[in-house]
């Protein structure tokens, strides 16, 4: 997956830091105070979407081959820049009973982006 560098507008991963204070969650999340969540941004032109390296799955690659040739019903489908790899992160927080919990929360960090 590409890292966004400001030079290209192709699907890439953009760095983004989430502060739990900003979204009002600092009263129940003990640690961390924030983290690099990141997000996906950019274009998915057919020549990129059809390549397995940037594609979300084998399925996406196959469908994009049909799309590139204008086959119905895929001709008008738009490929989107989405997370292809996510990572968990450990958090310390208060649960519904105000007990302190340490838990690995799944899919918190975008590691890589690709075309759907």
């Amino acid at each position: 997956g590409l890292e966004c560098d400001g030079k290209v507008n192709i699907c890439c991963k953009k760095q983004f830091f989430v502060s739990f204070k900003d979204i009002g969650w600092n009263d129940w999340i003990i640690a961390p105070s924030g983290y690099h969540a990141n997000y996906c941004e950019g274009e998915c032109p057919s020549h990129i979407a059809g390549t397995s390296g940037s594609s979300l799955s084998f399925h996406s690659t196959v469908i994009n081959h049909y799309r590139m040739r204008g086959h119905s019903p895929f001709a008008n489908l738009k490929s989107c820049c989405v997370p292809t790899k996510l990572r968990p992160m450990s958090m310390l927080y208060y649960d519904d009973g105000q007990n302190i919990i340490k838990k690995d929360i799944q899919n918190m960090i975008v590691e890589e982006c690709g075309c759907s």
Partner: antibody, heavy 123, light 108 residues
Framework: QVQLVQSGAEVKKPGASVKVSCKAS????????IHWVRQAPGQGLEWMGA????????NYAQKLQGRVTMTTDTSTSTAYMELRSLRSDDTAVYYC????????????????WGQGTLVTVSS | EIVLTQSPGTLSLSPGERATLSCRAS???????LAWYQQKPGQAPRLLIY???SRATGIPDRFSGSGSGTDFTLTISRLEPEDFAVYYC?????????FGGGTKVEIK
């Protein structure tokens, strides 16, 4: 301490509207969802919908869609539930309850409730 | 929507006895996102159990919850006079949130 204080009892005629308030204190209002639950006389609990105080996003029970509106005023930490076109079967005690609807962290139980507001619909 | 069925509808027991309340879901409740509430006449419900088995703040240890998937149980090991009330299960796995019909625990 956490408190949800609701407005007083109401008597309404069929076809009218009612707006019930729920004033929160003792916690960060925008960190939580406010859910509304009603209970007809001698009956069980019925979930009506929820609003996220941070964003105003709502989720309503299908049977009430189009008749119910939930809003919040973050400046006063108050949630409101308006029910329109009232019928006699809307006679119930209406409760607000708070929850953190964050499934990934296992959160979502209704840990604090308001005292309830009796709404009577009668001609 | 997930339909929750509670049984029995009424449980007639004496103080000191053990109460076992059942809650069955029409489909699997993801990650055991199931809560139990106690309601006494003229009062708002009170959270007893969340996450199927964790006791809420200030709830005595005679209350315990168990189960996963579609079958859940609330157990009161030794009934105290103040435990006679109506008990509801609720799922918070999916929208719409749904409640069971309730089980009334009454004095025999």
């Amino acid at each position: 301490q956490v408190q949800l204080v609701q407005s007083g009892a109401e008597v309404k005629k069929p076809g009218a509207s009612v707006k019930v308030s729920c004033k929160a204190s003792g916690y960060t209002f925008t960190s939580y969802y406010i859910h509304w639950v009603r209970q007809a006389p001698g009956q069980g609990l019925e979930w009506m919908g929820a609003i996220y105080a941070y964003s105003g996003d709502t989720n309503y029970a299908q049977k009430l869609q189009g008749r119910v509106t939930m809003t919040t005023d973050t400046s006063t930490s108050t949630a409101y539930m308006e029910l329109r076109s009232l019928r006699s079967d809307d006679t119930a005690v209406y409760y607000c309850a708070r929850a953190r609807d964050i499934a990934a962290a296992g959160l979502g139980a209704f840990d604090y409730w308001g005292q309830g507001t009796l709404v009577t619909v009668s001609s | 929507e997930i339909v929750l069925t509670q049984s029995p509808g009424t449980l007639s027991l004496s103080p000191g006895e053990r109460a076992t309340l059942s809650c069955r879901a029409s489909q699997s409740v993801r990650s055991s996102y199931l809560a139990w509430y106690q309601q006494k006449p003229g009062q708002a419900p009170r959270l007893l159990i969340y996450g199927a088995s964790s006791r809420a703040t200030g709830i005595p240890d005679r209350f315990s919850g168990s189960g996963s998937g579609t079958d859940f149980t609330l157990t009161i090991s030794r009934l105290e006079p103040e435990d006679f009330a109506v008990y509801y299960c609720q799922q918070y796995s999916n929208y719409p949130r749904t409640f069971g019909g309730g089980t009334k625990v009454e004095i025999k």
